[in-house]
């Protein structure tokens, strides 16, 4: 079938910005580290680098490869408040490269260091 | 209490970074419309903006206060095979702006559309 | 020892819902992949799902897929698969299955629960 | 989806006496991990399955060694040397080296 160069083009470019790569998002403190329930951090979230995006077929899953650690420094505050907001330092994950790789082998990896 | 300046305008920076505002996501086009399970598109994910990032309270919710609509022209491929793949053009929802809502607000928001 | 055992099977309408359950025993549940599996009557097997040790992550058969709905409480060392839409071709016993190895297989199975779609 | 061919259908064995079971898979299961992800399963008359063989040739815990497995690639097998009464049942081969993990039609063993 032949198909318009800018149909082709604006499906190529959709491809380009949905690809499977590390990306900015925000991370809930809290819920990342589950921490007990009367604590609480602000800000609330962090910004890192996580993998996302799509793969080009329904077995794979994106997946980082390499990992930094960030440390971040924020308050937290602890509800009786006995004292007042105190700084923490907390280290964050932060994905430098992906792949796309089989949703089995993903859990492989995970489940074989779980496992340990 | 005082609080280091460095410690100030790291903190300051990160609530500036999560803060609610539309943010460039990937979205599963099949998940998006509840499309049958024997059809596929290509690319699978579109790249549109919608709303995240962190609020400042527990009772808040980060949430679209306008929207608009996308065109994007995608390959859809149905299995079997019947034809090659067709294009398609589907409309896409893309939030232009957001703002930090109650969660009670954002349900009667949701449920007064539903009511209709 | 390991121990899995499921209940909420039965009879019910096509279209209807169902929840089976899978309560486990004897290892730590919380560190275990785990599947659920069929068996038509008369016939072999056939995979269905798998979720995470933390439940972060699930993957199913096409032929379930959109339908049902594995998920665990880890807190409660159960597992559980919801299945909606049901069809005369679900109708099987359903075992659920540990992943022992971390490898995406089989360890220990339970003993099944029967259920029967049909009008 | 990879498909696993069993044969024979089934197989009447004299006690004693040794059987094998083959299972042909549409697709390689070595991994690039070095494993092989093929296992063994017997289902006996009422019950559910149990694990006999993992990755090819490894016996699980309380297998007797007269049961063994051997292969690579595409091709497995499964014997037992000496088969005893309490052997006959259902026999599945399945692979999990990639998704839908996928069984073989299975392999009815009896007792003449």
């Known amino acids: 079938a032949h198909y318009n160069t800018e149909i082709l083009k604006s499906i190529d470019n959709e491809w380009r910005k949905t690809q499977c790569m590390p990306r900015e998002v925000c991370i809930d403190v809290g819920k990342e580290f589950g921490v007990a329930t009367n604590t609480f951090f602000k800000p609330p979230c962090v910004s890192v680098y996580r993998c996302g995006g799509c793969c080009n077929s329904e077995g794979l899953q994106c997946m980082n490869t390499s990992t930094s650690y960030l440390s971040k420094t924020l308050f937290e505050i602890t509800v009786p408040l006995s004292q007042g907001p105190k700084p923490v330092t907390i280290s964050f994950a932060n994905h430098t490269s992906c792949r796309c790789m089989s949703k089995l082998d993903v859990y492989r990896q995970v489940h074989s260091i779980i496992r340990r | 209490a005082h609080y280091n300046t460095e410690i100030l305008k790291s903190i300051d920076n990160e609530w500036r970074k999560t803060q609610c505002m539309p943010r460039e996501v990937c979205i599963d086009v099949g998940k998006e419309f509840g499309v049958a399970t024997n059809t596929f598109f290509k690319p699978p994910c579109v790249s549109v903006y919608r709303c995240g990032g962190c609020c400042n309270s527990e009772g808040l919710q980060c949430m679209n206060t306008s929207t608009s609509y996308l065109s994007k022209t995608l390959f859809e491929i149905t299995v079997p095979l019947s034809q090659g793949p067709k294009p398609v053009t589907i409309s896409f929802a893309n939030h232009t702006s957001c703002r930090c809502m109650s969660k009670l607000d954002v349900y009667r928001q949701v449920h007064s559309i539903i009511r209709r | 020892q390991v121990q899995l055992v499921e209940s909420g099977g039965g009879v019910v309408q096509p279209g209807r819902s169902l929840r089976l359950s899978c309560a486990a025993s004897?290892?730590?549940?919380?560190?275990?992949?785990m599947h659920w599996v069929r068996q038509a009557p008369g016939k072999g097997l056939e995979w269905v799902a798998l979720i995470w040790y933390d439940g972060s992550n699930k993957y199913y058969a096409d032929s379930v897929k959109g339908r049902f709905t594995i998920s665990r409480d880890n807190s409660k060392n159960t597992l559980y698969l919801q299945m909606n839409s049901l069809r005369a071709e679900d109708t099987a016993v359903y075992y659920c299955?540990?992943?022992?190895f971390g490898s995406g297989c089989f360890d220990y199975w339970g003993q099944g629960t029967l259920v029967t779609v049909s009008s | 989806d990879i498909v696993m061919t069993q044969t024979p259908l089934s197989l009447s064995v004299t006690p004693g006496q040794p059987a094998s079971i083959s299972c042909k898979s549409s697709?390689?299961?070595?991994?690039?991990?070095?494993?092989?992800?093929l296992y063994w399963h017997l289902q006996k008359p009422g019950q559910p399955p149990q694990l006999l063989i993992y990755?090819?040739?490894h016996r699980f815990s309380g297998v007797p060694d007269r049961f063994s497995g051997s292969g690579s690639g595409t091709d497995f097998t499964l014997k037992i040397s000496r088969v005893e009464a309490e052997d006959v049942g259902l026999y599945y081969c399945v692979q999990s080296i990639q998704l839908p993990l996928t069984f073989g039609g299975g392999t009815k063993v009896e007792i003449k």
């Open positions: 697709q390689s299961l070595l991994h690039s991990d070095g494993k092989t992800y």
């Open positions: 299955a540990r992943d022992g």
């Open positions: 990755e090819v040739s």
């Open positions: 004897g290892f730590t549940f919380s560190r275990y992949g």
